[in-house]
Amino acid sequence: HTAAQDNCTCPTNKMTVCSPDGPGGRCQCRALGSGMAVDCSTLTSKCLLLKARMSAPKNARTLVRPSEHALVDNDGLYDPDCDPEGRFKARQCNQTSVCWCVNSVGVRRTDKGDLSLRCDELVRTHHILIDLRHRPTAGAFNHSDLDAELRRLFRERYRLHPKFVAAVHYEQPTIQIELRQNTSQKAAGDVDIGDAAYYFERDIKGESLFQGRGGLDLRVRGEPLQVERTLIYYLDEIPPKFSMKRLTA
């Protein structure tokens, strides 16, 4: 794995422990919480990042309307079970034997049940809508410039191929970034849209996951883009299964 060889750190994940105990004395980094080896040349999976976070000490309408099946992460943080590849296991349970099914970004997609609950497969989140509201500025941003800057950010910082950034919508002060990635489209080595969205979310909140780098300084033609609210909607390849009680609540 590529890590900064000189001081043996993980540029893409500060929630790691690194030591030169890899093959040939190479720097090897392991995620906190899981102890799993991570590839420091790319983004760490959201599951391993959440696990590490839980183990750390506690301290005209152009905009898209999310579909009725869109999920929002209302459950917040939990200590997830990850598979050997670092992906979320389809079924997650807490210490009190309450279980639920999650999608590929770890968001609950069923009602909670007991240990008998079955989650047959990990359902892929293929469409993510990142809804941002920026702080007031002298004037609206130029849509084309904003589009280019956000695409550049996802390409260069999060290594997401631009073909997975389906659209950038803007209706001052709301910005929406649509990420789309079908299973058939995702090749080996491609960053997952769920991981890119999570890194972006943490950057926007001033909680960068990158090692020793300054926080995100987003500018459009030199004008700072400061986000004051973020909402993320997740759409799965198979709609979620919630009881009517939840849907009418």
Partner: antibody, heavy 118, light 111 residues
Framework: QVQLQQSGAELVRPGVSVKISCKGS????????MNWVKQSHAKSLEWIGV????????NYNQKFKGKATMTVDKSSSTAYMELARLTSEDSAIYYC???????????WGQGTSVTVSS | DIVLTQSPVFLAVSLGQRATISCRAS??????????MHWYQQKPGQPPKLLIY???NLESGIPARFSGSGSRTDFTLTINPVEADDVETYYC?????????FGGGTKLEIE
């Protein structure tokens, strides 16, 4: 304004290596990846690879693996490409080009001519 | 690799007329409504210069005489009206899939 300044022409013997440079100015160097492109009479334009100036690692065209090695020096805003074990097939003009919107190549260096001759 | 075939290889047009250059990809270069096809102009002794990105978006500073169109596998660069300064070689390039590839080029001449 954005500028990519490449090193001068090279006349080299077969079997040796050559390292060419590309210095970026007029923009934040680590905000954009840097492509390298080969232009020869026989093959038109060929993409050699791209280096992430943010991460410092490179992605190569399979055809140029083992032939080209890309590096970056963030402190001097300079990208480098070393070509190894040169043959007459490597005689060409080599361009650096900034990775732009939708992975286009929006700014190009003036080119470095490499001539391999005994 | 995605192969890009440009036609014609040579194109002769009169000043003030329309020039149309075609680029055909061996497979689709579209993703969610975005076409990963770009056009460049190259003058002798100079590097290529980006004219059009994402099939139809005019790069900043490029005259509106240049336009691009197309989707999936078939793309067109149009110059209307042609001026004397446009007598150059034009290339298409796809960035949908690695490795990015270029067309073989179209040389524009004045008849």
């Amino acid at each position: 304004q954005v500028q990519l300044q490449q090193s001068g022409a090279e006349l080299v013997r077969p079997g040796v290596s050559v390292k060419i440079s590309c210095k970026g100015s007029g923009y934040t160097f680590t905000d954009y990846g840097m492509n390298w492109v080969k232009q020869s009479h026989a093959k038109s334009l060929e993409w050699i690879g791209v280096i992430s100036t943010f991460y410092g690692d490179a992605n190569y065209n399979q055809k140029f693996k083992g032939k080209a090695t890309m590096t970056v020096d963030k402190s001097s805003s300079t990208a480098y490409m070393e070509l190894a074990r040169l043959t007459s097939e490597d005689s060409a003009i080599y361009y650096c080009a900034r990775r732009g919107n939708y992975d286009s190549m929006d700014y190009w260096g003036q080119g470095t001519s490499v001539t391999v001759s005994s | 690799d995605i192969v890009l075939t440009q036609s014609p290889v040579f194109l002769a047009v009169s000043l003030g007329q329309r020039a149309t250059i075609s680029c055909r990809a061996s497979e689709s270069v579209d993703s969610y409504g975005n076409s990963f096809m770009h056009w460049y102009q190259q003058k002798p002794g100079q590097p290529p210069k980006l004219l059009i990105y994402r099939a139809s978006n005019l790069e900043s500073g490029i005259p509106a005489r240049f336009s691009g169109s197309g989707s999936r596998t078939d793309f067109t660069l149009t110059i209307n009206p042609v001026e004397a300064d446009d007598v150059e070689t034009y290339y298409c390039q796809q960035s949908y899939e690695d490795p990015p590839t270029f067309g073989g080029g179209t040389k524009l001449e004045i008849e």
